[in-house]
């Protein structure tokens, strides 16, 4: 009957943890004798290729200064005490303790068995490290530049994480990689970049994060701060200003990042009806007369700079009924 | 790089225990098995015995209760209990590779009894 | 007990080549290694795994096994191979460990 080595054509292990590489003989033969078990790494150097070795009566020797014993060993392989104790080699399953990037390669687990001669079979090792992702809004000031808004890093990644955003904004991705401190590991930044403007503050944008160490991608929402000058409106006009009017109010409505500084209401006729009177960022007219027939400017100023918006009034004689009882009812 | 040395070969009237040591250089006794072989003059090698990595000793049939080896985390000795002259022999240390091949020797240490 | 034989000498022209044999009186369960060894020198690793060659052994060196017969083959033999050679193998057949050497071949380049 012919034996195999059952191995797994790839194991996956994390930098600075402990591995398995699973290797049994099967099927359990009667009379088969096992003089031997090697672990070799065949693409290393030639004095480092045996890295491990078990004979059924010497036991476990580890023959490459690298791993070596302290970081190796053998799971299940027991040797042969004396006239009493068969060794038990057919699981030759070895350990593998604090993963080094320098682990990673081919490894292949051999038996030299009698009368059936060598039979092996290889497993690939792969080291991998779980990367740490932060993401951050960066405090841009409006601009008609392209600037980065925000930044997504996954830090230490084996194999080098990928970084994807979400956002319905008009935006680009420039990504850069580097080392990470721990040897073999990557660094991965993403810039979030667009032309910062008042319409993107408060957006929240994603990070998507993927890496084959987690189960599903890590998403990490990021709020963007961008500094613009006020945006402003003005609401309150009904197109039924009328002479005599004494409820009227003009609201100015500001988009702001930082928070207005200061109102200011103005004309451009120059001339400021004294029935109106400015109170922050509302314009209260006690009476409407006939100065109003002009346009109504207000000019707000945050630490970035100004905004304006103007209103034309349009004063009547009496009021416009036209449409009053078709809004009302 | 890794070296082996062999000291304490000189020397002795029969019957006088004989302590010979080997002085390894990078290596870690802790993953090697470590054999003694000695050659006598004019003649073959022939093995003596070993000691594993985990510090189990196995030893030649005709060296049984004649040596004794053991070692420290730098050293690996030899003790000639009661040497007869047939015991006169350059004395090798040697390392066992995966496959159990002695793949690094000392240059030998010289042993003489004589009355 | 496990016994290698080994033809106390043999010689070679130099250039040639020769082949050295090494046979056990039982069929062995373990690999065979190869050592050269020259006057006042520790013996040198040759071969190992019955057909490996360690680093920095020239391949002119080469190693074969059938049986219970371990060859080590010389081509283009050369005046600096004139040296002892022993086969071993280790032998776990009874409840002890043995490491077995061959009686040795006294190689001799002529020529």
């Known amino acids: 009957q012919d034996v195999r080595v059952q191995v797994l054509p790839e194991v996956r292990g994390q930098l600075g943890g402990t591995v398995e590489l699973p290797c049994h003989l099967l099927p359990p033969v009667p009379g088969l004798y096992i003089s031997l078990v090697t672990w070799q790494r065949p693409d290393a150097p030639a004095n480092h290729q045996n890295v491990a070795a078990f004979h059924p009566k010497m036991g476990p020797s580890f023959p490459s200064p690298k791993p070596g014993s302290e970081r190796l060993s053998f799971v299940s392989a027991k040797q042969s005490t004396g006239q009493d104790t068969e060794a038990e080699l057919q699981d030759a399953t070895l350990a593998l303790h604090g993963l080094t990037v320098e682990d990673e390669g081919n490894y292949t687990c051999e038996f030299a068995t009698f009368p059936k001669g060598s039979v092996r079979g290889m497993t690939w090792l792969r080291v991998i490290a779980k990367p740490k992702n932060q993401a951050e809004a960066q405090k841009v000031t409006f601009s008609q530049d392209p600037t980065t808004v925000a930044l997504c890093i996954s830090k230490e990644g084996r194999p080098p994480a990928r970084i994807s955003w979400l956002s319905s904004l008009d935006w680009e991705a420039k990504e850069t990689q580097v080392s990470g401190t721990l040897a073999g590991t990557v660094t991965v930044t993403s810039r979030f970049t667009l032309v910062p403007s008042g319409r993107a503050d408060g957006v929240t944008v994603t990070c998507k994060v993927e890496h084959e160490s987690f189960e599903e991608p890590a998403l990490i929402p990021v709020t963007l701060s961008v500094r613009y000058p006020p945006e402003v409106s003005i609401s309150g006009y009904d197109d039924n200003w009328y002479l005599g009017r004494t409820d009227a109010t003009l609201s100015c409505d500001v988009r702001s990042n930082p928070e207005p500084t200061g109102y200011d209401w103005s004309t451009t006729s120059g001339t400021f009806p004294t029935s109106a009177v400015a109170q922050g960022s509302q314009l209260v007219i006690h009476a409407v007369d006939s100065l109003f027939n002009t346009t109504f400017v207000c000019t707000v100023t945050n630490a970035v700079g100004m905004g304006r918006a103007e209103q034309v009034i349009f004063v009547r004689e009496t009021p416009n009924t036209a449409g009053a009882g078709a809004t009302g009812g | 790089a890794q070296s082996l040395e062999e000291s304490g070969g000189r020397l002795v009237t029969p019957g006088t225990p004989l302590t010979l040591t080997c002085t390894v250089s990078?290596?870690?006794?802790?993953?090697?098995?470590m054999n003694w072989v000695r050659q006598a003059p004019g003649k073959g090698l022939e093995w003596i015995g070993i000691?594993?990595?985990?510090?189990g000793t196995y030893y030649a049939r005709w060296a049984k209760g004649r040596f004794t080896i053991s070692k420290t985390s730098t050293t690996v000795d030899l003790k000639i209990t009661s040497p007869t002259t047939e015991d006169t022999a350059t004395y090798f240390c040697a390392r066992s590779g995966g496959s159990m091949q002695l793949n690094l020797w000392g240059p030998g240490t010289l042993v003489t009894i004589s009355s | 007990s496990f016994v290698l034989t080994q033809p106390a000498s043999v010689q070679v022209n130099l250039g040639q080549t020769v082949s050295l044999t090494c046979t056990a009186d039982?069929?062995?369960?373990?690999?065979a290694s190869w050592y050269q060894q020259k006057p006042g020198q520790a013996p040198v690793l040759l071969i190992y795994r019955d057909t490996s060659r360690p680093s920095g052994v020239p391949d002119r060196f080469s190693g074969s096994s059938s049986g219970n017969t371990a060859t080590l083959t010389i081509s283009g033999a050369q005046a600096g191979d004139e040296a002892d050679y022993y086969c071993a193998t280790d032998d776990s057949s009874g409840s002890s460990y043995q490491y077995v050497f061959g009686g040795g071949t006294q190689l001799t380049v002529t020529g």
């Open positions: 039982t069929l062995s369960r373990s690999y």
């Open positions: 000691i594993g990595a985990s510090a």
């Open positions: 990078g290596i870690d006794l802790s993953s090697y098995h």
